[in-house]
């Protein structure tokens, strides 16, 4: 697994280098997570033909995966920094149960899956420091998450493969939208 941002030897070996700003650190963290997702997607696609699944088939699911919408204020039209930041943090918190599900779903990329999960927790902390209106952020109910996790793990193998593929695809799209929005802040 790649070394998380801020932990590579170059940072230690170059004390004269300017420390990263909060925004740069967040940007780097998201890009690091996206690299991890790419590696996981590669294993998923090599293992089965899930990656050829049609958008229609993937749309027929009952997963409530976070998705950016116009009202969230993260798109160029109608951009709203505070609303968007709340959406990004809330969405990442909602993704956490799905990232927990991904653990044990990978044979050769177990460490990578763990790295994506842990790096997302760090990203949430970075963003919470940036947010002014923390009260507007709703945390998912742990009991609901626990029963969702149990339900996902009870699915047959094909459904679990499809679910894994969809989570990775949706998380990638959510992070890419977040990255674009955060660069406007």
């Amino acid at each position: 697994a790649p070394v998380p941002p801020g932990e590579d030897s170059k940072d230690v070996a170059a004390p004269h280098r300017q420390p990263l700003t909060s925004s740069e650190r967040i940007d780097k963290q998201i890009r690091y997570i996206l690299d991890g997702i790419s590696a996981l997607r590669k294993e998923t696609c090599n293992k089965s033909n899930m990656c050829e699944s049609s958008k229609e088939a993937l749309a027929e699911n009952n997963l409530n995966l976070p998705k950016m919408a116009e009202k969230d204020g993260c798109f160029q039209s109608g951009f709203n920094e505070e609303t968007c930041l709340v959406k990004i943090i809330t969405g990442l918190l909602e993704f956490e149960v799905y990232l927990e599900y991904l653990q044990n779903r990978f044979e050769s990329s177990e460490e990578q899956a763990r790295a994506v999960q842990m790096s997302t927790k760090v990203l949430i902390q970075f963003l919470q420091k940036k947010a002014k209106n923390l009260d507007a952020i709703t945390t998912p109910d742990p009991t609901t998450n626990a029963s969702l996790l149990t339900k996902l793990q009870a699915q047959n193998q094909w459904l679990q493969d499809m679910t894994t593929h969809l989570i990775l695809r949706s998380f990638k799209e959510f992070l890419q939208s977040s990255l674009r929005a955060l660069r406007q802040m």
Epitope: N61, Q157, M162
Partner: antibody, heavy 119, light 111 residues
Framework: EVQLQQSGPELVKPGASVKMSCKAS????????MHWVKQKPGQGLEWIGY????????KYNEKFKGKATLTSDKSSSTAYMELSSLTSEDSAVYYC????????????WGQGTSVTVSS | DIVLTQSPASLAVSLGQRATISCRAS??????????MNWFQQKPGQPPKLLIY???NQGSGVPARFSGSGSGTDFSLNIHPMEEDDSAMYFC?????????FGGGTKLEIK
């Protein structure tokens, strides 16, 4: 052709244990989950649990925890189920069944192993 | 657990006529466009024979007179025309998730 060949009938005494086998052929054994199902004479079907031969991960019906133990042997492409502390309630036919994969592969069942518990 | 309610419990149909067996699930057995409902036929002393998988696909060697339909929570097995050899027990089963669950069975006889 996918085939599951189960071991022969067993007549066992109460309190004893029994271990039955399910030999798979015609597919990659480690790529599919193997389930076990119980059917008492003249009754319906009841899921016991499954084993994933790739990593030996198991999942059991709460009712059969402590009663059934699922194992597998990759080298011989064989799944096993051991039943312990047998009583007359365990007299039944036990089936192994390979899980399908989406609409591409159908489930496939063995012919069953009959277990009779009697003193 | 997903509960499957099968009806009727028994059914007598004349040769050449249509037999319809229903199976209702307590929650949807669909996922990503596939309905994980299977139908089995069982004769005394024999293992269950897979007739229909994923709601409407025929098992290998299954005659065309057996057909399955439905999605979500409501499914049915149709046999038409009814033949002598079709007298047996029929079960529905969901394989969407564990525990696998089964309907109570329908005893189909010749009228």
């Amino acid at each position: 052709e996918v085939q599951l060949q189960q071991s022969g009938p067993e007549l066992v005494k109460p309190g004893a244990s029994v271990k039955m086998s399910c030999k798979a052929s015609g597919y990659t054994f480690t790529s599919y989950v193997m389930h076990w199902v119980k059917q008492k004479p003249g009754q319906g079907l009841e899921w016991i649990g499954y084993i994933n031969p790739y990593n030996d991960g198991t999942k059991y019906n709460e009712k059969f925890k402590g009663k059934a133990t699922l194992t597998s042997d990759k080298s011989s492409s064989t799944a096993y189920m051991e039943l312990s502390s047998l009583t007359s309630e365990d007299s039944a036919v036990y089936y192994c069944a390979r899980e399908g994969y989406g609409n591409l592969e159908r489930d496939c069942w063995g012919q069953g192993t009959s277990v009779t518990v009697s003193s | 657990d997903i509960v499957l309610t099968q009806s009727p419990a028994s059914l007598a149909v004349s040769l050449g006529q249509r037999a319809t067996i229903s199976c209702r699930a307590s929650e949807s057995v669909d996922g990503f466009g596939i309905s994980f409902m299977n139908w089995f036929q069982q004769k005394p002393g024999q293992p269950p024979k897979l007739l229909i998988y994923v709601a409407s696909n025929q098992g290998s060697g299954v005659p065309a007179r057996f057909s399955g339909s439905g999605s979500g929570t409501d499914f049915s097995l149709n046999i038409h025309p009814m033949e002598e050899d079709d007298s047996a027990m029929y079960f529905c089963q969901q394989s969407k998730e564990v525990p696998w669950t089964f309907g109570g069975g329908t005893k189909l006889e010749i009228k």
